[in-house]
């Protein structure tokens, strides 16, 4: 088992909104849970976009999940990752 590296980034989306993206890379096996939490509970699936789990060329895998949020509300959101029985949460950078 190889644990993922998780990285959260933000980018401007439209006026007053930003897109936050949570990327997991370098993990094996390919099964992974990656999702956003808002106010400590699950964010509805229809407001999240998931990338495919793809090989990254090193025998490991990568994927991502993104959502659009209001600028200034970053503190309400965390990315949750679970892989091979281990899990972690990752805040949006200020």
């Amino acid at each position: 088992t190889v644990p993922p590296m998780v990285n959260v980034t933000r980018s401007e989306a439209s006026e007053g909104n930003i897109t936050v993206t949570c990327r997991a890379s370098g993990f094996y096996p390919w099964n992974i849970t990656l999702s956003w939490r808002q106010d400590g509970v699950s964010l509805s699936h229809d407001t999240q976009q998931w990338g495919d789990v793809l090989p990254d060329g090193n025998g490991t895998y990568q994927t991502w999940v993104a959502t659009r949020i209001c600028q200034g509300e970053e503190q309400r959101f965390t990315c949750y990752m679970e892989h091979s029985g281990n899990h972690s949460t990752h805040p949006v950078p200020s």
Epitope: D39, V41, S42, E82
Partner: antibody, heavy 119, light 107 residues
Framework: DVQLQGSGPGLVKPSQSLSLTCSVT???????YYWNWIRQFPGNKLEWM?????????NYNPSLKNRISITRDTSKNQFFLKLSSVTTEDTATYYC???DGRGAWFAYWAQGTLVTVSA | DIQMTQSPASLSASVGETVTITCRAS??????LAWYQQKQGKSPQLLVY???TLADGVPSRFSGSGSGTQYSLKINSLQPEDFGNYYC?????????FGAGTKVEIK
């Protein structure tokens, strides 16, 4: 270390409003986290009532309809519960508690305040 | 709303025994589950979150497991201080709800 302390009257008459205070020490309620009220009925059933967040937003249990209000006084580092039009069914031990944005589990609780609704 | 059904409602066990408490959710809660212990006259104390993670200071004889709608709390080698009520709580969505509790008595 953060500490929460609940306080308020132990006896409220039916149809009146129940008002409780949670005083927080060791952490500013505007910095982060979600500041909640939870109650436990006789018989031990637990019910989440709602929260006020670090940013001042609220989320309430729909079962309490329009009877609940959670507010705060940032200068005193306190948050408050107001429950209107109480009945004997609102007799319970009331707890204030905190969770963080990683997940809505309650790592910090105040001691309970028993509130009896009776004429 | 997601309903949480706990079983058994009560149990009695001897010191050193292993006991298991189960919690069933009315929908898939994807491991968004916490367990608490409450002793008479005290506030609940967090034991487990995210279904499997022990909270700080919780003895390793406690363990959480499960997925989907079915979750368990296991106490290995029950100790006298483990008596009390145990509750599960989901945090998949609002409103947050708790199980009705399991009373653990020491024989």
């Amino acid at each position: 270390d953060v500490q929460l302390q609940g306080s308020g009257p132990g006896l409220v008459k039916p149809s009146q409003s129940l008002s409780l205070t949670c005083s927080v020490t060791g952490y500013s309620i505007t910095n982060d986290y979600y500041w909640n009220w939870i109650r436990q009925f006789p018989g031990n059933k637990l019910e989440w009532m709602g929260f006020i967040s670090f940013g001042g937003s609220n989320n309430y249990n729909p079962s309490l309809k329009n009877r609940i209000s959670i507010t705060r006084d940032t200068s005193k580092n306190q948050f408050f519960l107001k429950l209107s039009s109480v009945t004997t069914e609102d007799t319970a031990t009331y707890y204030c508690a905190r969770y963080d944005g990683r997940g809505a589990w309650f790592a910090y609780w105040a001691q309970g305040t028993l509130v009896t609704v009776s004429a | 709303d997601i309903q949480m059904t706990q079983s058994p409602a009560s149990l009695s066990a001897s010191v050193g025994e292993t006991v298991t408490i189960t919690c069933r959710a009315s929908g898939n809660i994807h491991n968004y589950l916490a367990w608490y212990q409450q002793k008479q006259g005290k506030s609940p104390q967090l034991l487990v979150y995210d279904a499997i993670t022990l909270a700080d200071g919780v003895p390793s004889r406690f363990s959480g497991s499960g997925s989907g709608t079915q979750y368990s709390l296991k106490i290995n080698s029950l100790q006298p201080e483990d008596f009390g009520n145990y509750y599960c709580q989901h945090f998949w969505s609002f409103p947050l709800t708790f199980g009705a509790g399991t009373k653990v008595e020491i024989k």
